[in-house]
């Protein structure tokens, strides 16, 4: 229904009357409408609702509403529908995040690793290796490392110490004479490999594929996460050049990429879920920071002086 009434607070725009050449100041139309007839010396402008498939976000003096962005490509879903007041906005479904306007599944942290930061619709999950006293026995994109069962609190002893991948195994001690009784203290310590980690802050990665072969050897690379890229470690007795070589031997699917970070270059080991052929399960584009906001927000390149 065309609307002629002007609000007191509404802005104005200038319009040149084609018949007279006169510059007129007209009231803008509200968001969700457009100017179907400009004002004249004797009449107010006329506003009409944006037709289906078009929108105007703000009060305006434009003669045609903007076309909505095209439908969201699968598997994206509509975050905001195309309506008179809003453009269509697309986002990735739960369990996926947006990268270069495509959706990639959230990384699954392998056994021995837990979620450090939950994934969102714009950022991947960040994994971290389970710290001493914690473990993760299932690959997951949502679960954190869990604390070992406290055997002593249940009046039990640790029969088998936990690792990054397994919980403590609790049990009762058979009655021994005091001379042969094992010391419970020694049983509670995890394996030495589990107690020490060596960090080299410059080696960074995101899990790629993480199939059984890779995850078995992933203990040599411990993610501590920066942005959506995960930071790892290699033994500190290797030189940086040698370190790169060794990590690549251990994890053959690592890709080495250069990544500018601050004033200096950082060396990044990028680990993505296997995308052997498609390049699409994880975006094959260079790593960028997570894209924020609606990918099409700048696509209406025409700037209309009568809008806003």
């Amino acid at each position: 229904q065309p609307e002629q009434k002007a609000s007191n607070l509404i802005g104005t725009y200038r319009h040149v009357d084609r018949a007279t050449g006169q510059v007129l100041t007209c009231d803008k139309c509200p968001a969700g409408t457009y100017v179907s007839e400009h004002c004249t010396n004797t009449s107010l402008r006329v506003c009409s609702s944006c037709p289906v498939g078009t929108f105007t976000r703000h009060e305006n003096g434009i003669e045609k509403c903007h076309d909505c962005s095209q439908p969201c490509p699968w598997p994206m879903i509509e975050k905001l529908p195309c309506a008179a007041l809003t453009d269509r906005e697309c986002t990735c479904p739960p369990g996926m995040f947006q990268s270069n306007a495509t959706c990639a599944p959230h990384t699954v942290c392998p056994v021995g690793w837990g979620v450090r930061k939950k994934g969102t619709e714009t950022e991947d999950v960040r994994c971290k290796q389970c710290a001493r006293g914690t473990f993760s026995d299932v690959p997951s994109s949502v679960m954190k490392c869990k604390a070992y069962t406290d055997c002593l609190s249940q009046n039990l002893v640790v029969i088998k110490p936990g690792t990054k991948e397994t919980d403590n195994v609790c049990g009762t001690l058979p009655s021994f004479s005091s001379s042969t009784s094992p010391s419970p203290g020694t049983a509670i310590f995890p394996r030495p490999e589990h107690m020490e980690t060596h960090e080299v802050p410059s080696s960074t990665y995101v899990p790629k594929g993480m199939n059984s072969t890779e995850s078995n050897s992933s203990a040599s690379v411990r993610p501590k996460v920066l942005s959506s890229i995960q930071e790892g470690t290699v033994p500190d007795n290797t030189s940086s050049a040698r370190g790169k070589e060794d990590v690549n031997k251990t994890l053959p699917n690592l890709q080495v990429v250069n990544h500018q970070q601050g004033p200096h270059h950082r060396h990044i080991l990028k680990l993505l879920p296997s995308m052997e052929a498609t390049g699409g399960e994880k975006s094959s584009t260079p790593i960028k920071g997570p894209k924020r906001g609606h990918p099409r927000q700048n696509l209406h390149k025409h700037f209309d002086i009568n809008e806003h």
Epitope: G95, S141, G209, E276
Partner: antibody, heavy 116, light 113 residues
Framework: EVQLLESGGGLVQPGGSLRLSCAAS????????MSWVRQAPGKGLEWVSV????????HYADSVKGRFTISRDNSKNTLYLQMNSLRAEDTAVYYC?????????WGQGTTVTVSS | DIQMTQSPDSLAVSLGERATINCKSS????????????LAWYQHKAGQPPKLLIH???SRASGVPDRFSGSGSGTDFTLTISSLQAEDVAVYYC?????????FGGGTKVEIR
Amino acid sequence: EVQLLESGGGLVQPGGSLRLSCAASGFTFSQYMMSWVRQAPGKGLEWVSVIYPSGGSTHYADSVKGRFTISRDNSKNTLYLQMNSLRAEDTAVYYCARGHYGMDVWGQGTTVTVSS
Amino acid sequence: DIQMTQSPDSLAVSLGERATINCKSSQSVLYSSNNKNYLAWYQHKAGQPPKLLIHWASSRASGVPDRFSGSGSGTDFTLTISSLQAEDVAVYYCQQFYSLPLTFGGGTKVEIR
């Protein structure tokens, strides 16, 4: 080696049921969209169904909606297709396939024959 | 639903010659936000599962010989085999993955003349 292996096909009477399985190995199964695609004798490829990595979302072709159910068990690295109320036109080789921006890994297929 | 139409239905080409297969979608599969065409090409040999050749309309899948190339944008796409080899005898399918249901073209059978 990345592999998908289907099983569960066979001969079934119209109105009957069958459950297909697809065992995945060599990749992080829980990280991928998985689909079923079929090919009827002498016909082209037809997409049947897709399931999201977590299993939380599923979609079906109109031709099977309400009769087929796709599911997955990420702990067992296995994809399933439960087929009920089978019809003669469901006779086909059924493939499971990995991926959403192009299906990059396919199983060898399992044959389903619906006939009285 | 997006309909995919392939032409020709079959094609006989001499060894070493160029083979061209066309695919037309009933609506655009180009997403302007990332400038990607949501289209794939597959090769399907008798007795084998289909094999992904091309994704994003023009990106070759890993391990695919460079005699295979994909081109086109929007609604019109082409798969080209620059120099046909005996092992290329197969049925070729295009597939859109822009929207559900995912749809395939009817297939083009490539034979040796």
